[in-house]
């Protein structure tokens, strides 16, 4: 959400979040690394183009024209400098001058060595237990952000992994319209629209960067789960990886897995929607997971087929009107899983990304909670790999990513909610190896053509 240095009365009242980098002569003397030419404190650029009419509550939600309800000045970094105070480098660059390129490799979790698997699991568990060194989360909406006395900022520390969960929750939560009024649920800043892939791409990139810093390991990368196996079993649900099924309760994770000890955040939806509070850092119950166990919905008891990926990659338009979950011939809607793998919209269909979530049949299948199950990370790195292959094949053709009239939050130039510093969808609509410093080690299935008789 926001850097700890900006969660202050002064910063919130002034609307300026431009922290110092190396203040030699007192506070405010090196905002955004200005003394070393890294950046400047400038007005925030926020998308003001119209969104689609399905959101009728303009003025009622802090996520509108993000992040202007909180801050109107932030750091604009020069060249390859980046970060809340221009103290880091843009993805794919490193060094004191951010002038050296690096490329990390995201690999199939099942292809890792025993030591690498163990390292990844331990790293996730460390991220679950480690307070985020930079960001704090708001526990109240902007009108209550300074507390009942108007002088106590309502922010909390949160762990690196729970921050990853919280940002997703904040992007999908309902719009609170007041005590006694039903919250408005037909809003989602990270799903059911063109920003789905770009939002989740940045979401993963932030976690990966946070874990690299936590481990002091610049080569650390998030692996992926190739969920397009066509099977009715979860091949990564073993105790050396993401945890097998508990023998005591088929909806829980085996006690032999560290993930059985994890507790979820952002589960008190009733409170958030009726009281207008926000998810805080309090952990509740365990992760629930019952792969292929939803007997009431047989269509979600089997994972997507390898051919589904090959087919979706042949959908050449990134998105199509109405740029929503009922778009046809939209690559985004197809990989998100509201259309069938050929691109045809069908309200009964749940394919690819959506099917993988629903297959997990538990925490990972509930949108506001899903990142609490760490399989989310692996599911989304694979989804991002598909996205990156599409960008490669179609030369990152952004022409069908709408500049306006997409669902709120989904316009091309919208700052993705609630990331900081502000980052637009456009910035993530690029091939990863050339622009974002990572690549996938992956082989794509080729489409098998049947010869007509």
């Amino acid at each position: 959400q926001f850097p700890r240095q900006c969660a202050t009365v002064e910063a919130l009242r002034s609307g300026m979040c431009c922290p110092d980098l190396s203040p030699v002569s007192g506070p405010g003397t090196d905002r955004c690394g200005s003394s070393s030419g890294r950046g400047r404190c400038e007005a925030v650029t926020a998308d003001s183009r119209p969104h689609s009419p399905q959101y009728p509550h303009d003025g009622r939600d802090d996520r509108e024209v993000w992040p202007l309800r909180f801050f109107n000045r932030t750091c604009h970094c020069n060249g390859n400098f980046s970060g809340h105070n221009c103290g880091t480098c843009r993805p794919g660059w490193r060094g004191a001058a951010c002038d050296q390129r690096v490329l990390i490799v995201r690999r199939n979790l099942l292809d890792l060595s025993k030591e690498e698997k163990n390292h990844f699991v331990r790293a996730l568990d460390m991220a679950k237990r480690t307070t985020h060194p930079l960001f704090v989360i708001a526990t109240r909406r902007s009108e209550e952000i300074l507390g009942p006395d108007g002088n106590t900022p309502q922010f909390e520390n949160i762990s690196i992994y729970n921050y990853f969960v919280w940002t997703h929750y904040y992007s999908v939560k309902k719009t609170f319209l007041g005590v006694g009024q039903e919250s408005f649920g037909e809003v989602d800043f990270s799903h059911e629209g063109p920003a789905f892939l770009t939002w989740h791409r940045y979401h993963l990139l932030r976690l990966e960067k946070d874990m690299q810093e936590m481990l002091q390991e610049p080569s650390f990368s998030l692996p992926y789960w190739n969920f397009a196996t066509g099977k009715n079993v979860c091949d990564i649900c073993t105790d050396d990886l993401m945890g097998s099924r508990s023998n005591f309760d088929s909806t829980l994770i085996s006690p032999n897995s560290v993930f059985s000890q994890w507790r979820v955040v952002c589960d008190s939806l009733e409170d958030y929607d009726t009281l207008g509070t926000l998810c805080n850092s309090t952990e509740d119950g365990p992760i629930r997971r019952n792969p292929a166990g939803n007997v009431a919905r047989p269509m979600v008891q089997r994972l997507p087929e390898p051919q589904d990926v090959a087919q979706c990659l042949e959908v050449g338009l990134f998105d199509t009107p109405p740029f929503y979950s009922n778009s046809t011939n939209s690559f985004r809607n197809t990989v998100e899983g509201y259309s069938d793998p050929t691109g045809k919209y069908d309200p009964a269909v749940r394919s690819l990304h959506n099917l993988a979530h629903l297959f997990l049949n538990g925490t990972g299948g509930q949108t506001h909670l899903s990142p609490n199950d760490p399989i989310f990370v692996l599911l989304h790195t694979f989804t991002d790999a598909v996205f990156d292959e599409w960008l490669r094949r179609y030369n990152a053709d952004i022409s069908t990513f709408p500049l306006e009239n997409a669902p709120i939050g989904h316009n091309r130039q919208y700052n993705m909610v609630p990331f900081w510093p502000p980052v637009t969808n456009t910035e993530m609509f690029v091939t990863a190896p050339d622009n974002l410093g990572y690549t996938y080690e992956i082989q794509w299935p080729s489409r098998e053509f049947s010869v007509p008789e």
Epitope: R94, G95, A96, V102, T130, E213, Q216, S219, F220
Partner: antibody, heavy 121, light 107 residues
Framework: QVQLVQSGAEVKKPGASVKVSCKAS????????LHWVRQAPGQGLEWMGW????????VYAQKFQGRVTMTADTSTSTVYMELSSLRSEDTAVYYC??????????????WGQGTLVTVSS | DIQMTQSPSSLSASVGDRVTITCRAS??????LAWYQQKPGKVPKLLIY???TLADGVPSRFSGSGSGTDFTLTISSLQPEDVATYYC?????????FGQGTKLEIK
């Protein structure tokens, strides 16, 4: 100025444990990761692991996993390295050293004077 | 794990000579590499970080170069006080392994 002062030499029997301390001054240990490196007599340097004193996180080299424990006491600016189930091959000088992570700097820039641990029956 | 291989293991050179020590990584480590000098009976001392940046207080006759898998430490004009063992270390992926060392002597 930056200093890392380690505890004195130790003689231990095989199977025992040793705990080496490293007291930092001239900088805030919460702002740095502290690494441990050892050197057997006449041999090269061997990286053992690191601790982040700010939160207690540790990463150990696979070779030492299960035998080494690194801890920190920020109130006294001291880090500790405990090695258990000692064997003769653990006879070495143990160094504590710090890494400045600014811009991911690839270096261990200040080193303690070293602690000789001798394992002998 | 990335292995670091130094060559030569030992070398003898005359005062004033240009001396080159190489370090090869088993995988691409970009420029996440440091060089250290350890004089007999002393503590290792940082010479070079980020493959080519001279640490504070290190004489300018020392320099580092290379990126990716092949790195070089050069002493432009060998001095008697440079007798030591030199080590490289990478910081790209865990564990942060050292090279086996290069022992430098004066002829």
């Amino acid at each position: 100025q930056v200093q890392l002062v380690q505890s004195g030499a130790e003689v231990k029997k095989p199977g025992a444990s040793v705990k080496v301390s490293c007291k930092a001054s001239g900088f805030n240990i919460k702002d740095y990761f502290l690494h441990w490196v050892r050197q057997a007599p006449g041999q090269g340097l061997e990286w053992m692991g690191w601790i982040n004193p700010d939160n207690g996180n540790t990463v150990y080299a696979q070779k030492f996993q299960g035998r080494v424990t690194m801890t920190a006491d920020t109130s006294t600016s001291t880090v500790y390295m405990e090695l258990s189930s000692l064997r003769s091959e653990d006879t070495a000088v143990y160094y504590c050293t710090r890494r400045d992570y600014t811009y991911e700097k690839a270096a261990l820039d200040y080193w303690g004077q070293g602690t000789l641990v001798t394992v002998s029956s | 794990d990335i292995q670091m291989t130094q060559s030569p293991s030992s070398l003898s050179a005359s005062v004033g000579d240009r001396v080159t020590i190489t370090c090869r990584a088993s995988g691409n480590i970009y420029n996440y590499l440091a060089w250290y000098q350890q004089k007999p009976g002393k503590v290792p001392k940082l010479l070079i970080y980020d493959a080519k940046t001279l640490a504070d207080g290190v004489p300018s006759r020392f320099s580092g170069s290379g990126s990716g898998t092949d790195f070089t430490l050069t002493i432009s004009s060998l001095q008697p006080e440079d007798v030591a063992t030199y080590y490289c270390q990478h910081f790209w992926s865990l564990p942060f392994t050292f090279g086996q060392g290069t022992k430098l002597e004066i002829k």
